[in-house]
């Protein structure tokens, strides 16, 4: 019996087609992805093959103005329109709190939304009961397939799930649910979830009875043969893991941003064992036409976005200096504003020992592309912020050793004075440079804001300590020459859309007046 699994993950509100790098589509003839194009390909496969499941492995939420405006209603509407069969909860589905998940998505989705390792407690337990499930048995033709969901246990540090959801260890939580499916005589089981490729592989290895793992969170690109675009494969598709009980378990992921549609064909024997698996992600490029009906619906929904981008978010009573003459040479108040917003967006009261789990931010000055003039009545709009942060990036959470941070700050000024983008703006960090010293030895003082303290204060950076830092995904990926971050990071979790972080902060503050306050000094 043959099953076709179509899968997406980490779409991050790319409802419209995008450029090849998943930013805003500029030249339509070279654009990719988007739900209208995805629908064309999905329908093509559904028409050609008998047993097809369309699955999403989480993080539909967060990433473009679509999410900012529609807050998840767009996800439910268009996933319903594409007739998804199941979705696993990702960490970003909690970005607007549990209510922001329940109302727009859980109550509106026609498909089951899954996670076996999220347990509700307290008053939430009855409110959310039945709105998401640990697993679902799906009929496919004359057979049944069990889908069991999972979500990153780090979600409380990455999003806003509140205090009434407990995120258990994935493997511990999955095993009893898979066992339950086995007792229901379900012998074909897919683990669908959002914990990253390393955890996906562990699930394949450790959870008895899981036949296939469809993952997300790490934006992993797998491919067999010559890849069709710029993404470099992390391994073959499917990636085969030998389980502890000796089975070959295919593990798949489909990069991110709706650029690819994962396509996996699995052949099962009559006892539900995987006989063979093959496939590849399908690049959703312009050779696949956008479905006109879905496209018309997208255009209808778009109208509200255009109106939103010119509305006032808040006011500034000072000039927001985002000029390259400032932000690539010295502390600039636009950099301070953005870093403060980044930290504010990551406030999660962890426990009594820590005032927060993260206190530091770094931001490449070259990523700040425009100032905002306060003389226009002080008004700040989404449109203004899009000029400051035009790349559609995210502000991510990483864990780094102190020694890596020190290298990063040395890199920040290794060729100072040439108006290059790697000069770092900061938050929760006090840095002093001595430019008379040779490159690689110019950081003379580096103090960082404590997190394990009731009154935050600045202490010298410790080389062997592990620190959490918020930074642009561009830096996490080694951009602007920060190879040491990419090579040495100990953990990387993708965060919220950059403009959304800053716009939310400005809306919250209402009136802003960021200063230059001595975060970066030269001796």
């Amino acid at each position: 019996w043959e099953l076709t699994i179509l899968h997406t993950n980490d779409v991050h509100s790319r409802l419209e087609q995008t450029s090849e790098d998943s930013s805003k589509c500029v030249n339509a003839s070279r654009c990719m992805g988007g739900v209208a194009r995805l629908f064309t390909k999905v329908q093509q496969i559904r028409r050609a093959e008998p047993n097809v499941l369309l699955l999403d492995a989480g993080d539909q939420y967060q990433g473009t103005i679509w999410f900012t405006v529609y807050k998840g209603a767009e996800v439910a509407h268009f996933m319903n329109a594409l007739r998804y069969d199941a979705m696993a909860l990702g960490n970003h589905e909690f970005d607007n709190g549990v209510e922001g998940l329940i109302e727009p998505l859980l109550k509106e989705a026609k498909f089951p939304i899954l996670s076996a390792n999220i347990k509700a407690k307290g008053p939430l337990a009855s409110q959310i009961s039945g709105l998401y499930l640990p697993y679902k048995v799906l009929p496919v033709g004359d057979e049944v397939v069990g889908i069991v969901g999972y979500t990153s246990k780090e979600t409380p540090f990455l999003s806003n799930p509140g205090t009434n959801l407990v995120f258990e260890d994935e493997i511990t939580a999955l095993q009893p649910e898979v066992d339950k499916l086995k007792t229901l005589n379900v012998n074909k089981i897919i683990a669908l979830g959002h914990s990253g490729f390393e955890t996906d592989k562990l699930i394949a290895q450790k959870v008895r009875g899981v036949d296939v793992v469809v993952g997300g969170h790490s934006n992993t690109f797998l491919y067999t043969g010559n890849p069709p675009s710029k993404e470099v494969p992390a391994g073959k598709y499917p990636f085969i893991v030998t389980s502890d009980d000796g089975r070959k378990v295919p593990v798949v992921q489909a990069y991110a941003f709706g650029k690819y549609l994962g396509y996996l064909k699995i052949e099962f024997d009559e006892r539900g064992n995987v006989i063979s698996s093959h496939g590849n992600p399908i690049l959703l490029n312009s050779s696949i036409p956008e479905d006109p009906s879905i496209k018309a619906d997208i255009n209808k929904w778009r109208i509200k976005l255009d109106n939103y981008s010119t509305q006032e978010l808040g006011k500034t009573i000072v000039y927001l200096d985002g000029s390259s003459q400032s932000c690539r040479f010295r502390e600039c108040n636009m950099g301070n504003l953005i870093c403060d917003a980044m930290i504010n967006n990551n406030l999660r009261h962890a426990d009594e020992m820590f005032w927060n789990h993260v206190s530091m931010c770094i931001l490449n000055g070259g990523g700040i592309r425009s100032p905002i003039d306060e003389r226009n009545n002080g008004t700040i709009t989404w449109e203004n912020l899009a000029a400051v942060l035009p790349f559609g990036g995210t502000f991510d959470l990483v864990q780094l050793k102190g020694s890596t941070l020190k290298k990063a700050f040395e890199h920040s000024v290794h060729r100072y004075g040439q108006s290059t983008g790697e000069f770092l703006q900061v938050g929760g960090i006090h840095v002093v440079y001595d430019l008379s010293r040779k490159p690689g030895d110019r950081v003379v003082k580096l103090d960082v804001l404590c997190t394990k303290c009731r009154v935050p204060s600045y202490d010298p950076l410790k080389m062997d300590e592990i620190y959490k830092v918020i930074l642009p995904n561009f830096l996490a990926n080694g951009g602007d020459g920060f190879q040491m971050i990419k090579d040495e990071l100990l953990r990387h979790d993708s965060g919220d859309q950059d403009i959304n972080v800053v716009s939310t902060y400005i809306s919250k503050m209402k009136v802003i007046y960021p200063a230059v306050e001595g975060r970066i000094k030269f001796s």
Partner: antibody, heavy 121, light 107 residues
Framework: QVQLVESGGGVVQPGRSLRLSCAAS????????MHWVRQAPGKGLEWVAV????????YYPDSVKGRFTISRDNSKNTLYLQMNSLRAEDTAVYYC??????????????WGQGTMVTVSS | DIQMTQSPSSLSASVGDRVTITCRAS??????LAWYQQKPEKAPKSLIY???SLQSGVPSRFSGSGSGTDFTLTISSLQPEDFATYYC?????????FGGGTKVEIK
């Protein structure tokens, strides 16, 4: 082979009740949404009811809502339509039809031969 | 409710003719449209689903097209066994609705 066979039709007085059955064979009945569709003499097709594969949802058009109830017994591979408060305009051939394997609306790939219901005093 | 309007309501054609039947939805239904053939005193038979997919066992002279609100069923070369009534049906949303039918008669 895949087959649907309706039964239970007949002549009934207005205001009375009737229960139709549909016996399924040749496929995994519990995996499919099942529908009733009717056709009044000389008229077109009208959808009457659906029950999801797992019985979790049932839908009806306004014309029968509150009077007709669709049900199924997966252990017996049988679909039912309980028709109460029958009216003259319910006179039609009633077909049972197989839908899809999901919770989305679907088309009908297999039809029964139909059973005639006449509501007349 | 979504209204389905079929045209023409009847047509006369000869064996070998190309026949086109149209179906219009009162609102967008994407490609969630099916076509059925019904002969007198018989149950309907599924021809096409998802606007353009041929049901297995249906001759290739039948084809469907369209998306959104406007759909077409085409019989490329009418055969004697094709004289029947044809219905379209939307399955975008409940309640499911049919077109009024198009009767194809011998000229």
């Amino acid at each position: 082979q895949v087959q649907l066979v309706e039964s239970g039709g007949g002549v009934v007085q207005p205001g009375r009740s009737l229960r139709l059955s549909c016996a399924a064979s040749g496929f995994t009945f519990s995996n499919y949404g099942m529908h009733w569709v009717r056709q009044a003499p000389g008229k077109g097709l009208e959808w009457v009811a659906v029950i999801w594969y797992d019985e979790s949802n049932k839908y009806y058009p306004d014309s029968v809502k509150g009077r007709f109830t669709i049900s199924r017994d997966n252990s017996k591979n049988t679909l039912y339509l309980q028709m109460n408060s029958l009216r003259a305009e319910d006179t039609a051939v009633y077909y049972c039809a197989r839908g899809g394997s999901s919770w989305y609306p679907d088309s009908f790939d297999i039809w029964g031969q139909g059973t005639m219901v006449t509501v007349s005093s | 409710d979504i209204q389905m309007t079929q045209s023409p309501s009847s047509l006369s054609a000869s064996v070998g003719d190309r026949v086109t039947i149209t179906c219009r939805a009162s609102q967008g239904i994407s490609s969630w449209l099916a076509w059925y053939q019904q002969k007198p005193e018989k149950a309907p038979k599924s021809l096409i689903y998802a606007a353009s997919s041929l049901q297995s066992g249906v001759p290739s002279r039948f084809s469907g097209s369209g998306s959104g609100t406007d759909f077409t069923l085409t019989i490329s070369s009418l055969q004697p066994e094709d004289f029947a009534t044809y219905y379209c049906q939307q399955y975008n949303s409940y309640p499911l609705t049919f077109g009024g039918g198009t009767k194809v008669e011998i000229k």
